[in-house]
């Protein structure tokens, strides 16, 4: 029996990220006896739910059960049956549901009620569905990347976990871009956080962190596009909108009712003499960039410095992990390399946006046209947001690391959320045992 492995003493947790454009289910696993150690939790599965975000089910709530089935069944397969009953399931909804709640709290409640009813039918320990705040979304994203990068570990390491990891214990900032909101979170250098709404205090593994965070609702890539279209159609002379953020030759008909459906476009709403308009792409990065900048109000700042819309932003400090749509978009555009300068990114975006739509479709035949058509806007938006919105410069650009996964776990708020809810990030540094429990007898 010398080398006979004992049954794995592991635990599992499930988090569903109910985003504005889609829902993803994440399964996490960790050794039961090392719960309080830093960096022991890792992702074993991601299942992307087929279909839109849950906020789109407002008129068809009865379809939510079927919508969640495939990924919940996948979780049933991945997690051993003996562990099902003790595996917690959490669903966190983000900005798509925040926007729905702004429109109608009753409708948002109804969607969450049906989600809860559906998830309660599985053999797991369902802990409820809730709309997380923008502040939580930012904070948990920051916790996730720093946990995975080993920044909370007090042991000094001579090696680097990931290629871009600096070997000091300075935490990384977190930049998260979703469809409906974007979050910026970091520890400022000796700077007072002038706005209490943006200040978070954490004590993690025996160390205090004063963290700045803000979530910009309506400034996720999808809602920013709706905002831009609503702003630009105001000054269109007819029902043709010549749009520099789409490729030359691209055409798409938009219903005005769809444009004004979201609370994000309310400030641009006006009575138009048509029910539909046609976007006609002209593919000009510079003009697209200028149009996007009009979404950021930088004329007013009640603090020593602001991002935009009068929101306090301290001076940027240290390295940043940019994830979610920051990563997906830049990955598609092949711009995630550490070696690509901001000037090079801008050059590539100019070329990409100027490419004719027919050419783009041929080059990326496997990509859905709806997504493909929006990469010019999304890439330009990311540059505008990071440079003019958050005040990154050509020099500080090299401190932005576009991250998809760290150590096999997706960068995003879900891991931090689960670590918090399962009390797996202790306030104090755990006492290290002389010997860890061996898996072998």
């Amino acid at each position: 029996t010398q080398n006979k492995a004992l049954p794995e003493n592991v635990k599992y947790g499930i988090v569903l990220d109910a985003g504005s454009s889609h829902t993803s289910l994440y399964i996490y696993k960790w050794p039961a006896e090392k719960e309080n150690d830093t960096g022991v939790v890792h992702q074993v599965e991601e299942c992307r739910v087929k279909g839109p975000g849950i906020s789109k089910f407002v008129q068809k709530v009865n379809a939510i059960g079927i919508y969640l089935t495939a990924c919940m069944e996948r979780a049933r397969e991945v997690i051993p049956r003996s562990q099902h009953q003790e595996t917690p399931v959490y669903l966190g909804a983000t900005a798509g549901m925040r926007l729905l709640r702004m429109e109608s709290e009753e409708l948002a409640d109804r969607v969450l009620d049906v989600v809860e009813r559906s998830l309660s039918n599985y053999p797991f320990d369902f802990q409820g569905a809730r709309i997380i705040t923008g502040q939580e979304e930012g904070a948990y994203g920051w916790i996730t990347i720093n946990y995975l990068l080993g920044k909370f570990s007090q042991k000094t390491r001579w090696f680097s976990i990931v290629p871009y990891e600096t070997n000091n214990q300075e935490t990384f900032g977190a930049l998260d871009l979703g469809g409906a909101s974007t979050q910026v979170t970091f520890v400022p250098q000796n700077q007072t956080i002038e706005s209490p709404d943006n200040a978070l205090q954490f004590r993690l593994y025996g160390k205090d962190y004063n963290v700045y965070t803000h979530s910009f609702l309506c400034y996720g890539k999808d809602q920013a596009l709706w905002q831009k279209l609503a702003k630009d159609i105001q000054v269109a002379s007819n029902e043709i909108l010549r749009d520099p953020c789409f490729h030359p030759g691209y055409k798409k008909v938009v219903n005005v009712s769809d444009l004004y459906k979201t609370p994000c476009t309310k400030r641009f709403e006006m009575t138009l003499p048509f029910q539909q308009f046609e976007i006609q792409g002209i593919g000009n990065y510079q003009q697209c960039h200028q149009s996007i900048l009009e979404l950021f109000n930088t004329s007013y700042c009640p603090y020593s410095q602001c991002a935009f819309n009068g929101i306090f932003l301290p001076p940027l400090q240290g390295d940043f992990g940019a994830f979610s749509a920051f990563y997906f978009v830049m990955k598609f555009l092949n711009l995630t390399s550490e070696k690509v300068s901001q000037e090079k990114v801008t050059e590539m975006m100019k070329k990409f946006c100027a490419q004719p739509w027919e050419e783009i479709k041929t080059s990326y035949a496997g990509v859905k046209e709806k997504y493909l058509s929006e990469y010019c806007f999304s890439g330009t938006y990311i540059l505008s947001l990071l440079l003019q919105g958050y005040h990154f410069t050509a020099d500080s650009w090299e401190h932005i690391h576009f991250i998809g996964k760290i150590q096999g776990s997706d960068a995003g708020w879900t891991l931090g959320y689960m670590l918090n809810l399962t009390n797996m990030i202790p306030a104090e540094q755990p006492l290290s045992t002389p010997l860890s429990h061996s898996t072998y007898v």
């Epitope: 709290e105 009620d113 809860e116 309660s120 409820g128």
Partner: antibody, heavy 121, light 107 residues
Amino acid sequence: QVQLVQSGAEVKKPGASVKVSCKASGYTFKSYEMHWVRQAPGQGLEWMGRINPSVGSTWYAQKFQGRVTMTRDTSTSTVYMELSSLRSEDTAVYYCARGKREGGTEYLRKWGQGTLVTVSS
Amino acid sequence: EIVLTQSPGTLSLSPGERATLSCRASQSVASSYLAWYQQKPGQAPRLLIYGASNRHTGIPDRFSGSGSGTDFTLTISRLEPEDFAVYYCQQYHNAITFGGGTKVEIK
């Protein structure tokens, strides 16, 4: 569908305590706050406080602080309201009412049928 | 705490008529924090309007709410026999308070 079923009528002596229960069904119990509101005979509505069933935290109206205790039992999806040091003016119908989800607004969407508490020597 | 004053105390109207009920707050109330309830004898109150102007599920469109700041109104466009009841407004600002109620009775 959502149901809130309250315990039956009670007759109490002055100085005694009363504990009224409210059993919830048809939704995820921990997701919504529960409030208690009372109504004296022929009078208006008076808010007493609320409990968050998820964590058990409470918030009481100033008038009732020190005399009211709200608790919950998540295993039976039941909330309780105990009022001590009863006096005749506590004679009223006591209602539980389901409030908001976290982050929502404080209006009372669904009410129990009410429990009449009579305080008489 | 915010005091809500409802007027009139009693409103005597005939079926088919329009009813206008007023609720005045002692200090400004965010619109999203004002609601209206209907209560019939021997029954629990029922939510009609939330967020000052949003009709709760299943509430007929003859009921409408309006107002902002300190002055709010519940309007019943054409009274039906089942609408004769007591109506309460409610606000939330740290604590919940209710108005004293308006009784709508048959003339």
